[in-house]
């Protein structure tokens, strides 16, 4: 039974092979039971986690995991190394950044020893599942009266990120957003000096090094303005 | 193993042109982004440009920007660099690598740009 899984992660082409034993007419076989899907996510390009829900299995097991890459010069099958655990079962494995090869088919293969049958296998493309740490050392420049730029660092190449600036102000229910390219420069034309702004950034590896869909973790914020502004007329609504 | 040779570099006047190539063979060119870097004398190595597995992205060192365009011809296996308004402070030996530059692996042989006044 070859079956094709549709993930949210960019990875259009992967697929599961689950083989089989026959099922006794009376009693579902152990080796039947689909095993959990792996997710793989790669840091930074530092190190990558797969991890898979380990409480989906109907008693606890130690599934291994094996990987290696489809067409290269790096198919020897591998063992994992670095087992992640979850209350004493394995839950995933970590690789560094030496097994980490982006541009390749990354295959991914989760197996249970006691039914050595019972494997489920995925093919990845690694360059979709990089996560960049959060943007870090934000910084504000006046460049007029009115006109605020936003700078920020990444721990990565710059030009293989593209970025989501947030800003509001304390009078604002939601954020305005706007992207970024790996210029990594956001400029702000009007701002009002009465006003208390709030700017905070997320970064993805694409869509030069990667397509990934996921995003980092938000920045840590950053102020600019009035602490004393004109009151907040939202506070006197909720106040009323 | 991988393989890239560069070609097309040599010397011109400022405000001139050249138009780099790198032949690559040993890996899925398709696959990987592409990287155009380049050494002065007595200077790092520096990134100029990068372009990605698909050529639908560019990205360009602030430096460049505008004069130099990057491309790449997957079937021939083959990138390349457009220098236009050269200038004498773009004079350096020119590296293709494959990846987004990050240093690994090692580039090419080079080809040489010597821009005079």
């Known amino acids: 039974l070859n079956t094709t899984i549709l993930t949210p992660n960019g990875n259009e082409d992967t697929t599961a092979d689950f083989f089989l034993t026959t099922m006794p007419t009376d009693s579902l076989s152990v080796s039947t039971l689909p095993l959990p899907e792996v997710q793989c996510f790669v840091f930074n390009v530092e190190y990558m986690n797969c991890t898979w829900n380990s409480s989906s299995e109907p008693q606890p097991t130690n599934l291994t995991l094996h990987y290696w890459y489809k067409n290269s010069d790096n198919d020897k099958v591998q063992k994992c190394s670095h087992y992640l655990f979850s209350e004493e079962i394995t839950s995933g494995c970590q690789l560094q950044k030496k097994e980490i090869h982006l541009y390749q088919t990354f295959v991914v293969q989760l197996q249970d020893p006691r039914e050595p049958r019972r494997q489920a296998t995925q093919m990845l493309k690694l360059q979709n599942l990089v996560i960049p740490w959060a943007p870090e050392n934000l910084t504000l420049h006046k460049l007029s009266e009115s006109q605020l730029e936003l700078n920020w660092n990444n721990r990565f190449l710059n030009h293989c990120l593209e970025h989501l600036v947030q800003y509001r102000t304390d009078w604002d229910h939601s954020w305005t957003e706007q992207s970024v390219d790996y210029r990594h420069k956001f400029s702000l034309p009007s701002v009002d000096g009465q006003k208390r702004y709030t700017f905070r950034v997320r970064s993805r590896f694409n869509p030069l090094c990667g397509s990934a869909q996921h995003w980092s973790e938000w920045s840590h914020p950053i102020h600019w303005g009035s602490n004393t502004s004109k009151e907040n007329p939202f506070l006197f609504a909720l106040e009323a | 193993q991988v393989q890239l040779q560069e070609s097309g570099g040599g010397s011109v006047q400022a405000g001139g042109s050249l138009r780099l190539s790198c032949a690559a063979s040993?890996?899925?060119?398709?696959?990987?982004?592409m990287t155009w870097a380049r050494q002065a004398p007595g200077k790092g190595l520096e990134w100029v440009s990068t372009?990605?597995?698909?050529?639908?992205?560019?990205a360009y060192a602030a430096s460049v920007e505008g004069r130099f365009t990057i491309s790449r011809d997957n079937a021939k296996s083959t990138l390349y660099l457009q220098l236009n308004s050269l200038k004498t402070e773009d004079t350096a030996m020119y590296y293709c690598?494959?990846?987004?530059?990050?240093?690994?692996?090692?580039p090419g042989q080079g080809t040489q740009v010597t821009v005079s006044s």
């Open positions: 372009i990605a597995s698909d050529g639908g992205s560019t």
């Open positions: 690598t494959k990846g987004y530059g990050d240093g690994t692996p090692a």
């Open positions: 040993g890996f899925s060119f398709s696959s990987y982004p």
